[in-house]
């Protein structure tokens, strides 16, 4: 049983990486002297209590920054937010903290991240680039929901 977070780097199919800008994650083309974030991820320890066949439920954070990705409704709209939170505190909680959990599905080299709190909503970036990460229900051309996740050992 793994009880320390794994580290990884993420880019989308357009080779954009995730960068932290003013406490917001944005996707930008990789350039020299740029510092993409390193992702910290850990599987939910209560995996048996969550839906089967949707992917591996994980907590997603930014390595070394005590920031985790979470989903919350603003009005009627689920939104993606960064919250100050220790990923291991989430991991150790008595119950799955659904607002911070994502079903991680892999198909070949592509990964998707679906909100556990809001099924059908996925982490996405606008096809335009330089935009914040969002949650979307629309898996069409306007947004990219497929990411390449490379684990760092």
């Amino acid at each position: 049983k793994i009880d320390t977070p794994q580290r990884g780097s993420i880019q989308d199919i357009n080779h954009r990486v995730w960068v932290l800008q003013d406490q917001t994650l944005i996707a930008v083309p990789r350039k020299d002297r740029m510092s993409p974030v390193t992702i910290a991820l850990i599987s939910c320890r209560h995996v048996e209590t969550l839906e089967k066949d949707r992917g591996n439920p994980i907590y997603l954070g930014l390595n070394g920054l005590n920031l985790c990705l979470m989903c919350a409704k603003v009005g009627d709209q689920p939104t993606l937010q960064l919250k100050e939170k220790d990923i291991m505190d989430l991991y150790n909680q008595p119950e799955p903290v659904k607002s911070f959990l994502f079903y991680h599905s892999q198909s070949g080299r592509n990964s998707t991240f679906e909100s556990v709190a809001f099924p059908g909503w996925f982490i996405a970036v606008s096809s335009e680039g330089g935009c914040p990460l969002i949650l979307t229900q629309e898996l069409g051309k306007a947004n990219t929901t497929d990411f390449g996740l490379t684990m760092l050992f």
Partner: antibody
Framework: EVQLQQSGAELVKPGASVKLSCTVS????????MYWVKQRPEQGLEWIGR????????KYDPKFQGKATLTADTSSNTAYLQLSSLTSEDTAVYFC??????????????WGQGTTLTVSS | QAVVTQESALTTSPGETVTLTCRSS?????????ANWVQEKPDHLFTGLIG???NRAPGVPARFSGSLIGDKAALTITGAQTEDEAIYFC?????????FGGGTKLTVL
């Protein structure tokens, strides 16, 4: 306003089964975890188990495995506790409680008023 | 299974500070026990006060605070009021189940 309304007192015979209900208003039970707790006079509280109404998955304290069955009906916003093979040891007040995440922690924040179960021949 | 022990009864006066504690038979209470504190008033009226050791539930007055003191979880009421007279239960998480204490009957005279 959040309210948990439990079913009325029950008097049942040893060996029988009983199903207690907890009807919730003011929030959707799919958005939280529902816990059940037993209270006997002078014996504190005992955790029976919990259910995630969003997927029906229940977890039990080992002491109550086989004795208690937790279910939930999201259409009526109601959680249920069924107790089987009743004995005098099951005579107690049973509470449902919401176990809810706010910002940085889980809390047993709202409780039902309790259902008194008496097992007697 | 672990046994969780609380003071059976405590008495305080209005305006005083009182601390209730919660001990585990399996060793020191830590933040991984996610201590919760609930209040019971007459007629089985329960209210959650503290979660995750030291987080106050929404709407709970600031005079209630949770902490770890030595090897125990603690609930401190700073400036007790007559309406705080109640039974207080702590609950500790042990990896896959909760164990509650027997409760502390607090009298505010």
């Amino acid at each position: 306003e959040v309210q948990l309304q439990q079913s009325g007192a029950e008097l049942v015979k040893p060996g029988a089964s009983v199903k207690l209900s907890c009807t919730v208003s003011g929030f959707n039970i799919k958005d939280t975890y529902m816990y059940w707790v037993k209270q006997r006079p002078e014996q504190g509280l005992e955790w029976i188990g919990r259910i995630d109404p969003a997927n029906g998955y229940a977890k039990y304290d080992p002491k109550f495995q086989g004795k208690a069955t937790l279910t939930a009906d999201t259409s009526s916003n109601t959680a249920y506790l069924q107790l089987s093979s009743l004995t005098s040891e099951d005579t107690a007040v049973y509470f449902c409680a919401r176990f809810h995440w706010y910002d940085s922690a889980f809390y047993f924040d709202f409780w039902g008023q309790g259902t008194t179960l008496t097992v007697s021949s | 299974q672990a046994v969780v022990t609380q003071e059976s009864a405590l008495t305080t006066s209005p305006g005083e500070t009182v601390t209730l504690t919660c001990r585990s038979s399996s060793g020191a209470v830590t933040t991984s026990n996610y201590a919760n504190w609930v209040q019971e008033k007459p007629d089985h009226l329960f209210t959650g006060l503290i979660g995750g050791t030291n987080n106050r539930a929404p709407g709970v007055p600031a005079r209630f605070s949770g902490s770890l003191i030595g090897d125990k979880a603690a609930l401190t009421i700073t400036g007790a009021q007559t309406e705080d007279e109640a039974i207080y239960f702590c609950g500790l998480w042990y990896s896959n189940h909760w164990v509650f204490g027997g409760g502390t009957k607090l009298t505010v005279l």
